[in-house]
């Protein structure tokens, strides 16, 4: 025998109190699949969380973070404070990157400058707290007898901190 509740579409629930009639989800609740016996309570975006997408009867609300914060975790389960470029977030708040490291984003950690000499190249542009060094041609390429100059290698693509 087919379960009568299987006929209830998303956005409704199978109401046992009313002879298994498909009743609409009440306000602030949803069912994203058919055949549900209850509707789930919608997520509330409170405090540092901000509503990005309101709950509908078939889909949960989605939150993001208020200005000055960014999302972390699956489905933006946490909001983490932004820092300025050239800083990283520590337990004591935002701290400047130490000499020899940089951060070109408002999130994530300070990372060491690229070591140009490991690739046999010279430093074309010095690094800062906000920017990586730019490596230039190798010293051999700059010798008087060299007929051409190889284009500078692109700066290393910065990694992204986990979302």
């Amino acid at each position: 025998l087919q379960d009568p509740c299987s006929n209830c579409p998303a956005g409704t629930f199978c109401d046992n109190n009313r002879n298994q009639i498909c009743s609409p989800c009440p306000p602030n609740s949803f069912s994203s699949a058919g055949g549900q016996r209850t509707c789930d309570i919608c997520r509330q975006c409170k405090g540092v969380f901000r509503t990005r997408k309101e709950c509908s009867s078939t889909s949960n609300a989605e939150c993001d973070c208020t200005p000055g914060f960014h999302c972390l975790g699956a489905g933006c389960s946490m909001c983490e404070q932004d820092c300025k470029q050239g800083q990283e977030l520590t337990k004591k708040g935002c701290k400047d990157c130490c000499f020899g490291t940089f951060n070109d984003q408002k999130r994530g950690i300070c990372r060491p400058w690229t070591n140009c000499s490991l690739d046999g190249k010279s430093v074309l542009v010095n690094g800062t707290k906000e920017r990586d060094v730019v490596c230039g041609p190798s010293p051999a390429d700059l010798s008087p007898g060299a007929s051409s100059v190889t284009p500078p290698a692109p700066a290393r693509e910065p990694g992204h901190s986990p979302q």
Epitope: G11, K53, E54, S59
Partner: antibody, heavy 116, light 107 residues
Framework: QVQLQQPGAELVKPGASVKLSCKAS????????INWVKQRPGQALEWIGN????????NYNGNFKTKATLTVDRSSSTAYMHLSSLTSKDSAVYYC?????????WGQGTTLTVSS | DILLTQSPAILSVSPGERVSFSCRAS??????IHWYHQRTNGSPRLLIK???ESISGIPSRFSGSGSGTDFTLSINSVESEDFADYYC?????????FGSGTKLEIK
Amino acid sequence: QVQLQQPGAELVKPGASVKLSCKASGYTFTNFWINWVKQRPGQALEWIGNIYPGNDNTNYNGNFKTKATLTVDRSSSTAYMHLSSLTSKDSAVYYCARGQLGLDYWGQGTTLTVSS
Amino acid sequence: DILLTQSPAILSVSPGERVSFSCRASQNIGTTIHWYHQRTNGSPRLLIKFASESISGIPSRFSGSGSGTDFTLSINSVESEDFADYYCQQSNSWPFTFGSGTKLEIK
């Protein structure tokens, strides 16, 4: 910034129908409910119904089920309310307002006058 | 439908005074109540959501309290711009309903 733009006034004859508009801007139209609220002169607010532009979910106040039809045009980020078989009792200010539960942004309202 | 009763219909106060508005629901609605004010010829504006949660951009003199069936909106020191109509609204069940409103007027 979030804005809901409504025409200032509509004049229609008894028995006719009218389609009121509410153009949304400053946010993702498909992510937030649009509600419609009626207010007769000197009277309280009366909730007509709402629509979720992302999937056309609607909820209606039973008093307006045969009177009002809510639709949206996603391409222009505009919500509409069609009112049929108009009588003098339908003369009122009609507001559109954004929100799933609490209504956080409101249009300026359209004054509908039903008169011969 | 859930009936919201607001009392009194009219409140007369002087600027600087504290004032409280009452909203009573016909059944238990938890904290699913929201408060608005509406100035003459203006649109309603959300003041408090979910009984007590503040709204960005709304002055801190507005506060809300209550749960179940009895709710209160308070203004701790009324300013001239606060003289308006005040409405409560429930979002506990369809259809959403509004209270009949309380008019705040200058004494």
